[in-house]
Amino acid sequence: QTSVFPPEVILPRGGSVKVNCSASCDQPISLGMETPLPKKEILPGGNNWKMYELSNVQEDSQPMCYSNCPDGQSSAKTLLTVYWTPERVELAPLPPWQPVGKNLTLRCQVEGGAPRANLTVMLLRGEKELSRQSAVGEPAEVTTTVPVGRDDHGANFSCRTELDLRPYVLKLFENTSAPHQLQTFDLPATPPQLVSPQVLEVDTQGTVVCSLDGLFPVSEAQVSLALGDQKLNPTITYGNNSLSAKASVKVTAEEEGTQQLLCGVMLGNQTQETRQTVTIYSFPAPNVNLTKPEVSEGTEVIVECEAHPRAKVMLNGVPAQPPGPRAQFLLKATPEDNGRSFSCSATLEVAGQLVHKNQTRELRVLYGPRLDEKDCPGNWTWPENSQQTPMCQAWGNPLPQLKCLKDGTFPLPIGQSVTVTRDLEGTYLCQARSTRGEVTREVTVNVLSPRYE
């Protein structure tokens, strides 16, 4: 009977081991070991035993001891099990961005490592074990699927191998892959909310606000705002899970027409867009034309109002007939028309909205000078010593100068409070003079003495 010791050995790859071969008889005819491994006999041996050192053991092997005794030939094998940790433990790259609510597949590749029966592959989130599987195949590939939430943003995922040799050598060997950080994102299915004027007048400024709620992580969101081909530079305000982008838009004549206002919110590898039509219009105030802004009374005046070709005008509240961009009327100028305002109101429909513009012109009517009985009575009778205010109003445009003189020298104090004396009595010649000429009127003042009362 041939014996081998130890009957089983677990050793690191490339390691050495001493194996004892012994025969059951005292004087074996032959005693030895058969192995492809490099072996060296350790001397001195005994009559019925030999010790061998096997070196550079790279793989599992079963060296065989044999002996030849008088009662026959026999052999025995020792089981050499080589252990080694994996040469490569690698977690497959994670997607650059992972949508929240979608499952993530983690994939780990393990190259090498033995004995495989003692090799376990674990997928980890931080230090938390997500999955534990045996290593099968070369390379071994282990996968697991995990649901992804917002709290997984920034989490580190890795793959770890455990070579558990505790039953044999009281050792546990661990290899961990480089960690991969997960970036998750949540972009709602709802498009951004866009608030902007539907119509904007050329050479004015408008404000555009684009906002979106339910974003995660909001700090990573990018906003693109454009009016037509013009890139807008918004000021972005971030909330907990929301953002608001505000931009000022100054529109010039180049922008006149229909433009698309576009707001795009980009997060992860997704975009949500909202488009809105903005109509930019040019609408100068209507022109109010008078044949002449200054005319003499009795002159015929044409008042004309003209606006944007697509506008409808009203002149002094009267719509153009037929409705359109032009209205006019004819009048004979009277003094009452002096300072009269002619107002033209133009209305233009822009993208279903009515916009209004007004223009006003004043007519100056030259007339007079005039001295009427109504405003400059020809006769005054006042009691002596009473307080009176002589009144005489001259009319005209330009406003005439008025003088009332008795005997060419003594003035009547028009508009002033006076004590009536005998000196005030008499006939005054009132003269109203302007650049248009002069008119005169006699005014008589009678003074009643107290004896007549």
Partner: antibody, heavy 119, light 110 residues
Framework: QVQLQESGGGLVQPGGSLRLSCAAS????????MSWVRQAPGKGLEWVSA????????YYADSVKGRFTISRDNSKNTLYLQMSSLRAEDTAFYYC????????????WGHGTLVTVSS | ASELTQDPAVSVALGQTVKITCQGD??????ASWYQQRPGQAPVLVIY???SRPSGIPDRFSGSSSGNTASLTITGAQAEDEADYYC????????????FGGGTKLTVLG
């Protein structure tokens, strides 16, 4: 569908005048800005002039300012380019094109009309 | 006037991806539009705004913008894509309303 058809091209002597027309159909003409773009034979595109939908604003390239006049008749759905003091370097295919707004990109183009300035 | 600069010529193998670029200061403020012109034909708008295609333009055409550069990308170029391509933008210098690049002649090989 949108159609733009230029006409009025031909051979003209240096210093001469020519009026190009562009008849438009298939869209609301008065709501669109219109432009003229030219292309000398074998060369690239060059913007020439533009006019707003209402006709209230007009724009010209420096190379034609003071010599060319753009206008439109919205009642006839027609765009015009009055060209005077013509030079040899004005020889080109002249395209009319429409834009949703005055400074905007060109949505549709006509097939072009050739203007040759030569003595 | 501001200028837009394009490579005069670019070639691509059939079915491969090609990027045509356009550079100019105005592109910091405005998006470029891109026009395709086949020999003897009028130009046709293929891309406008940030990356919008008019109806009828295949989705293999796409646009992008970064800084002072605009790009037109054709993913999976077809023989019928062989043409001149012009970029065009508003003129931020204010001298002209719009300016064109010099054009890029695209050749599809194979």
């Amino acid at each position: 569908q949108v159609q733009l058809q230029e006409s009025g091209g031909g051979l003209v002597q240096p210093g001469g005048s020519l009026r190009l027309s562009c008849a438009a159909s298939g869209f609301t003409f008065s709501s669109y800005a219109m432009s003229w773009v030219r292309q000398a034979p074998g060369k690239g595109l060059e913007w020439v002039s533009a006019i707003s939908g209402s006709g209230g604003s007009t724009y010209y390239a420096d190379s034609v300012k003071g010599r060319f006049t753009i206008s439109r008749d919205n009642s006839k759905n027609t765009l015009y380019l009055q060209m005077s003091s013509l030079r040899a370097e004005d020889t080109a295919f002249y395209y009319c094109a429409n834009s949703a707004y005055t400074g905007g990109w060109y949505d549709y183009w006509g097939h072009g009309t050739l203007v040759t300035v030569s003595s | 006037a501001s200028e837009l600069t394009q490579d005069p010529a670019v070639s691509v193998a059939l079915g491969q991806t090609v990027k045509i670029t356009c550079q100019g200061d105005s592109l910091r403020t405005y998006y470029a539009s891109w026009y395709q012109q086949r020999p003897g034909q009028a130009p046709v708008l293929v891309i406008y705004g940030e990356n919008s295609r008019p109806s009828g333009i295949p989705d293999r055409f796409s646009g992008s913008s970064s800084g002072n550069t605009a790009s037109l990308t054709i993913t999976g170029a077809q023989a019928e894509d062989e043409a001149d391509y012009y970029c065009n933008s508003r003129d931020s210098s204010g001298n002209h309303l719009r300016v064109f690049g010099g054009g890029t002649k695209l050749t599809v090989l194979g």
